[in-house]
């Protein structure tokens, strides 16, 4: 969490941002809140990015002002206009690119004063893994697949019954570059699995950690998966 204060002649206002991660090829949100004002026309929001000449986005007098927007953000940004009045200056970013990573500044002017806070935005790719029984294999085998990751993650298998066991000798992981030549498909195969056991395929990079679980019994197969972003820190 980054909390910034204004330092102008006018009073300072508190601006709060939260570091976050964007998923390449999806929409992202850069979070920023501030002490609200009673008049929308008195609020100015400016989003800036370190190393970028033009503005990322500007909102003033109740609407977007795009004349100074940098080329790399054209047609890709919007604030939640109906929530500005309650102090939400968060920016929606369309079609996140690897190059969107960096340090952003959320700068606010209201009738109460000015304030700003920085935000670290990481970009990469992360997706939910799906674990299935591979019926084509000669022995009982599990196949864990996740369609989009970047940077290249690590893949670790674990089991409920054999806690702490190292499965690296009985697993094989491959990474296949996707068509846009950035993200990769992750495929990991675990051999010699036993029934009545729960196996977990854990995929992790510096942005996200995802787990796919599978429980195989004689009568049924149960699956569960979840994903957690690793770098959401508030400022």
């Amino acid at each position: 969490l980054i909390i910034g204060f204004g330092i102008s002649g006018r009073h300072s206002i508190t601006v709060t941002t939260v570091a976050s991660a964007g998923n390449i090829g999806e929409d992202g949100i850069l979070s920023c809140t501030f002490e609200p004002d009673i008049k929308l026309s008195d609020i100015v929001i400016q989003w800036l990015k370190e190393g970028v000449l033009g503005l990322v986005h500007e909102f003033k007098e109740g609407k977007d002002e795009l004349s100074e927007q940098d080329e790399m953000f054209r047609g890709r940004t919007a604030v939640f206009a109906d929530q500005v009045i309650v102090g939400n200056a968060s920016l929606r970013l369309k079609n996140v690119q690897l190059t969107d990573a960096g340090t952003y500044k959320c700068y606010i002017i209201t009738s109460k004063g000015k304030g700003n806070a920085n935000l670290e935005y990481k970009t990469g790719a992360f997706s939910m893994p799906e674990v299935n029984v591979d019926y084509n294999a000669s022995s009982e085998t599990l196949r864990c697949e996740a369609p989009r990751w970047f940077p290249q993650p690590t893949v670790v298998w674990a089991s409920q019954v054999d806690q702490g066991a190292n499965f690296s000798e009985v697993s094989n992981t491959s990474f296949e570059l996707n068509s846009e030549n950035v993200t990769m498909k992750v495929v990991s195969v675990l051999y010699n699995v036993t029934i009545n056991n729960t196996y977990s395929c854990m995929i992790e990079n510096d942005i996200a950690k995802a787990t796919g679980d599978i429980k195989v019994t004689e009568s049924e197969i149960k699956r569960r998966s979840h994903l957690q972003l690793l770098n959401s820190k508030a400022s």
């Epitope: 090829g25 999806e26 929409d27 977007d64 795009l66 054209r74 047609g75 068509s179």
Partner: antibody
Framework: EVQLVESGGGLVQPGGSLRLSCAAS????????MSWVRQAPGKGLEWVAY????????YYSDSVKGRFTISRDNAKNTLYLQMSSLRAEDTAVYYC?????????????WGQGTTVTVSS | EIVMTQSPATLSLSPGERATLSCRAS??????LHWYQQKPGQAPRLLIK???QSISGIPARFSGSGSGTDFTLTISSLEPEDFAVYYC?????????FGQGTKLEIK
């Protein structure tokens, strides 16, 4: 050659449901945002919804929010529009359209459309 | 929501004449304005992107101008195949809106 072929249109009663499909070929489907745009008889174009290249992000026009669901299957190169709680005013030709790759928000390729008629 | 207003609703001209179609946005959209042509029974076709940028395969007689709230599509010398409906589209935000269209008909 880029091709977008819509299907699934037809006659449906008010309150009913319908699923439209759009089969894409001639380009790397999984790299592009895709949209549905509709056109009521004798009227102008109305953007309906978009879905991100990976399928994880969607955005809808206010007129269909909560009733329509856009999705995609990149393995099948297919875009979908699940329409429910249909109203007479949803009667239109529905086009699937590809958004520009570099900077979105304009449509460089369109399908020929599929007709949806909502009537009792 | 940004409202796009096109004028005139109908424009009657003869082949060889110059056509000027207007589009106005309810608020400034910089140059985030795109133009499409639609013929009866066909899908729309992209003509101009970002107010004035030409599209590969589109004849040079089609040009666009404007910024902020006021935009113009110009067809320098009308060909018979140019008679169609023309739409402008706001491309600045997430909720994409079209104008109601200008029908270009033969006089």
């Amino acid at each position: 050659e880029v091709q977008l072929v819509e299907s699934g249109g037809g006659l449906v009663q008010p309150g009913g449901s319908l699923r439209l499909s759009c089969a894409a070929s001639g380009f790397t489907f999984s790299n592009y945002y895709m949209s549905w745009v509709r056109q009521a008889p004798g009227k102008g174009l109305e953007w309906v919804a978009y879905v991100s290249s990976g399928g994880g992000s969607t955005y809808y026009s206010d007129s269909v929010k909560g009733r329509f669901t856009i999705s995609r299957d990149n393995a099948k190169n297919t875009l979908y529009l699940q329409m429910s709680s249909l109203r007479a005013e949803d009667t239109a030709v529905y086009y699937c359209a590809r958004e520009s790759y570099s900077q979105g928000n304009y449509f460089d390729y369109w399908g020929q459309g599929t007709t949806v008629t909502v009537s009792s | 929501e940004i409202v796009m207003t096109q004028s005139p609703a109908t424009l009657s001209l003869s082949p060889g004449e110059r056509a000027t179609l207007s589009c106005r946005a309810s608020q400034s959209i910089s140059d985030y304005l795109h133009w499409y042509q639609q013929k009866p029974g066909q899908a729309p076709r992209l003509l101009i992107k970002f107010a004035s940028q030409s599209i590969s395969g589109i004849p040079a007689r089609f040009s666009g101008s404007g910024s902020g709230t006021d935009f113009t599509l110009t067809i320098s010398s009308l060909e018979p195949e140019d008679f169609a409906v023309y739409y402008c589209q706001n491309g600045h935000s997430f909720s994409l809106t079209f104008g109601q269209g200008t029908k270009l008909e033969i006089k």
